[in-house]
């Protein structure tokens, strides 16, 4: 009961974590900077990975794609490759995972089958959520270490001067909610390796032996019947004892005079 | 990078009309805000009048009712119509712009060079 509930919790706080994902992906607010110096009207500027958008004070909101590969920072480029395999990983151990829940019956799917895709699963989403927080971490240090800031004051061609706007880009929603999926994702991934431990079945080897009547010259030896568990010095499926006790296969080759009463 | 050119500046009488037109050009991303600045000799730059690109504009308070700001998206390009000229208004008129050359770079202040009106008998 409790690999079961250990096994959905896993696979829910993955699949929330990895909407998360696909969210702070697709958003647009991973960086943001406030314009003061505006006689006009207040000026909302804000990046995504997939576009860059500017509000002003009265609503009005334009946003424009990156359409070009070839000028885009190489980092920038990191982020967006890392955010997408995540998504990829974390899709398809979602995909893994639902046919690997104890609660779903697909045909005759044995239990250590069913352990083995948890496992396989768990490891997608731990790697899924480290490669989210891996993005949204090298895109906060783009910005902590001001990267953006590559024009200040310096003169054109034209004769026209160009001067950055003092102002700095501050973390946007889309890094928090990052990080925050990007740990669901990596915590759910634990909880589904954790399950696998406990949905792998245990190699106990309950032999079927057949005991038979015996002739009086074999004596009956105390404590001889032993389960094997695989870990015992009786693997190899040895006569535990002299006379009448053997295993299924044994009385099938070897008929004996002892056999037959 | 933006550049931003100025033109339509001269001599004109008082009471007379001008208009001013900045044209920006280069790798244009997005221009949010155009703005008219002047700067009258030994004096300060001051903010005249400008525009955004919501259709939001503002005006100083000495050329408000005189002077008409105006904004052309799809050029990339800002007008000031001034009415009413008066030897006050005598200065170098700068284009400003709020821009960014590419998205995910800061937005920045370009400049144009400037452009000399003269109101004068």
């Known amino acids: 009961m409790a690999v079961t509930a250990c096994q959905g919790l896993g696979f829910v706080v993955s699949l929330i974590g990895i909407a998360g994902i696909i969210a702070a992906t697709c958003m647009d607010q991973w960086s943001t900077q406030d314009l003061y110096n505006n006689p006009v009207t207040a000026v909302f500027n804000y990046q995504g990975l997939w576009r860059s958008c500017v509000r002003e004070s009265s609503g009005f909101t334009e946003c424009r794609g990156y359409f070009t590969l070839l000028g885009l920072p190489a980092m920038l480029q990191a982020v967006r490759a890392l955010m997408i395999v995540g998504i990829v990983l974390g899709a398809i151990g979602l995909l893994v995972s639902i046919f690997a829940l104890k609660c779903i019956r697909i045909g005759s799917m044995e239990d250590s089958a069913k352990a083995n895709m948890t496992l396989t699963s768990g490891i997608m989403f731990i790697v899924s959520g480290l490669c989210a927080i891996a993005g949204v971490s090298v895109f906060a240090n783009m910005l902590v270490t001001n990267f953006w800031m590559s024009t200040a004051n310096m003169y054109t061609g034209m004769g026209g001067m160009v001067q950055t706007v003092q102002t700095r880009y501050t973390f946007g929603a889309a890094l928090f909610v990052g990080w925050v999926a990007g740990g669901l994702t990596l915590i759910g991934g634990v909880m589904m390796c954790i399950a696998c431990r406990g949905l792998a079945p245990e190699e106990t080897n309950y032999k079927a032996v057949s005991y038979h009547a015996s002739g009086h010259s074999v004596a009956y030896k105390p404590g001889g019947f032993k389960a094997s568990t695989g870990f015992g010095s009786n693997t190899k499926n040895k006569k535990i004892y002299d006379g009448g006790a053997r295993t299924e296969d044994e009385v099938q080759s070897y008929p004996s005079k002892h056999d037959y009463v | 990078q933006v550049q931003l050119v100025e033109s339509g500046g001269g001599l004109v009488q008082p009471g007379g009309s001008l208009r001013l037109s900045c044209a920006a050009s280069g790798s244009i991303f997005s221009i949010p805000v155009m703005t008219w600045y002047r700067q009258a000799l030994g004096k300060e730059r001051e903010f005249v009048a400008g525009?955004?690109?919501?259709?939001?504009?503002n005006y100083a308070d000495s050329v408000k009712g005189r002077f008409t700001v105006s904004r052309d998206n799809a050029k990339n390009t800002v007008y000031l119509q001034m009415n009413s000229l008066k030897s006050e208004d005598t200065a170098v008129y700068y284009c400003n712009a709020q821009a960014s050359s590419f998205g995910w770079m800061p937005l920045s202040d370009y400049w144009g060079q400037g452009t000399q009106v003269t109101v004068s008998s």
């Open positions: 525009i955004s690109k919501g259709g939001t504009s």
